[in-house]
Structures are given as C-alpha cells and as structure tokens.
C-alpha cells in the first residue's frame, strides 16, 4: 500500500494525517514529540518540525498511536509504533505538527 502524509490546517502547521489503505486518518498524540514531528515534516520536504497536541479533532480513522521516532528516520514507517489502526484514543487527542525549512 502507498502511504503519504499531509497537514490539515495551514501549509506548515496543523493536524498531522497519514494516508493508508485508501483512507486519510489521524495520529494519536500519545508519545508524540518533536522527534516524531521532525520525521513527519521531513516527509513533506521540511528540515525542522515540532510536535503539537490536541490541535482540533479530525474525523474517520485514527491510524497511528504510540509513535516513537529517534528523529533520524527518513519516514514515520521506520519508527516504533502500534499496528495500523490499533489505538486507545479519541479524535480529541489528534496530533499535530509545525514544520519549518
């Protein structure tokens, strides 16, 4: 399956979403920190990123939870995380990012 990411809000700041199995979904902010945000932002071509929490509830799937990156990974998929769709979160806990060049 092809996977991609997007920011919902402005071009560089807002809710972090991932595309998996034909559907856009959100990331739970459990364990979500700047190391994870840096990797997410790098996937969009940015060099810096910082984590945001409770940025406004999304809808649909919550695809990822307990994402734990070192910050050196090239994609989120290389980071430790729960299996796709496995979480104990609500959309009130949707993670966000602010990315920067």
């Amino acid at each position: 399956n092809s996977v991609s990411v997007r920011i919902v809000g402005s071009s560089n700041r807002g809710r972090a979403e991932v595309y998996y199995s034909g559907t856009w979904g959100t990331i739970c902010d459990d364990e979500w920190d700047n190391s994870d945000a840096i990797v997410f932002c790098r996937m969009l071509g940015y060099s810096k990123g910082r984590a945001l929490s409770s940025v406004g509830a999304g809808t649909g799937q919550i695809w990822l939870d307990n994402v734990q990156c070192r910050g050196t990974e090239s994609t989120l998929w290389s980071c430790t995380k729960n299996s796709w769709g496995h979480h104990d979160c609500s959309h009130e806990e949707d993670a966000g990012v602010e990315c920067s060049v």
Epitope: N12, R13, D29, D30, D33, N34, S47, K48, R50, A51, L52, S53, S54, V55, E92, E93, G96, E98, S100, V101
Partner: antibody, heavy 120, light 107 residues
C-alpha cells in the same frame, strides 16, 4: 476573552515552600497546554514549566527542575506550581500562560502575574 | 540553551513612522519564533508566531519576517497604542527562551 488569574504569591524565607494557583475562565481549559513564566526584577522573561492538556507531559527549565512541580486540575480549571527549596534567585513575578494548542506551543494568553519574594 | 539577542534595547519614534526590531538566535530555529507586546497594567499579548503569522486581533501594520537565525518585527505607521516593550521568543527547543526586550518610546 480568556482570563487567567494567579494567586498564592508572597514573601517567604529561603528554603521554604509556596504553591501558586492560576484559575482559568472563558475557554475550555482541558483542551490547552499551560505554562509558568517568570520575570525577576529588572530581568528578562524566563519560561520555567509546561504541562500538556491531559497532564501526560511536563517539562521544566533546568533552573527549577527537581524543586518545582507543575500540575493541573481540569475539573477546577486550575493550574498549579508547587515551589520547594526556594532560593533568593526565585524572586520574580510569576505568570501563567495558555498555549495555542494542547501541548508545547506559543503563549497566546497571559495572566497579570503574582509576585514571589524569597528573602530572609 | 538557545540565546536570543534582541536589538535595539531602546527605540524612539513618532506616530506615523515605521520601525524595525531585530532578533538573532544563537543557532538556527527555523521559523519557530514569536513576538510579544508588554504594556503596563495589561497582560502580555502574542502578536506574531511561526515567524510571520499574525495572531488573531493583531493589526496588519505589524509584520514578522526571517528564518534560521535572523528575524525582524516591523511596525508601519505607528499608532499611539504601539508604544510598549516587545519581546521575541524561540519555540524550537527546550527551554524556550526570550530576547531581552525592546522598549519603543514616543519621540
């Protein structure tokens, strides 16, 4: 308009303890990260502590780590700062400030501040 | 810690003029920078975040620019209520740090 009202300041002796409170109103307190920032007399602003909306994450400046504890009670719309082993260099105006979002973020609303004086 | 060096410390200008305040970071902070306004008997106000994004309620005569280590706050066509103290603040890494402030006074 967001309101943040600090209380609990005063004059204390070095080595003693104090607990500051910040009562929030006119916004959904439980959705936002909260911070304590201080300003010593004739000095600049110093961020000292942050707590996430759900209390899951707390961060501190090195100058207060191990001595100060940030906490919150979302049912009471109240932020706290418990200060132990106070030193003269902790003398400052203490402000609570709301984050733009639920965790670490820019400070979009500030209280008027409460003065803490540590002196013998 | 990231050191934030703000200049000038004092600035005198007249209503209607334009002024610029500089803020330099000791390392690259991307665009993770905010500007605040401090006025007596008022609570501190967030003016600009993410380097250049105007906070809701900030007049359009305020603008922010820069990235990396060099940032500028510009106020065009100064109004009487703009005379205040201005601070920059980095939000790239803990601990969040502030500039020492610029006091904008009426000439």
């Amino acid at each position: 308009e967001v309101q943040l009202v600090e209380s609990g300041g005063g004059l204390v002796q070095p080595g003693s303890s104090l607990k500051l409170s910040c009562v929030a109103s006119k916004f959904t307190f439980s959705n936002y990260g909260m911070n304590w920032i201080r300003q010593a007399p004739k000095k600049g602003l110093e961020w000292i502590a942050l707590i996430y909306y759900n209390s899951n994450n707390k961060y501190y400046a090195d100058s207060v780590k191990g001595r100060f504890t940030i906490s919150r009670d979302n049912s009471k719309n109240t932020l706290y700062l418990e200060m132990n082993s106070l030193r003269s260099e902790d003398t400052a105006m203490y402000y609570c400030a709301k984050s733009l979002t639920g965790g670490s973020d820019y400070f979009d609303s500030w209280g008027q501040g409460v003065m803490v004086t540590v002196s013998s | 810690d990231v050191q934030m060096t703000q200049s000038p410390s004092y600035l005198a200008a007249s209503p209607g003029e334009s002024v610029s305040i500089s803020c330099k970071a000791s390392k690259s902070i991307g665009t993770f920078l905010a500007w605040y306004q401090e006025k007596p008997e008022k609570t501190n106000k967030l003016l600009i975040y993410s380097g250049s994004t105007l906070q809701s309620g900030t007049p359009s005569r305020f603008s922010g620019s820069g990235s990396g280590t060099d940032f500028t706050l510009t106020i065009r066509n100064l109004e009487p209520e703009d005379f205040a103290v201005y601070y920059c603040q980095q939000h790239d890494e803990y601990p969040f740090t502030f500039g020492s402030g610029t006091k904008l006074e009426i000439k």
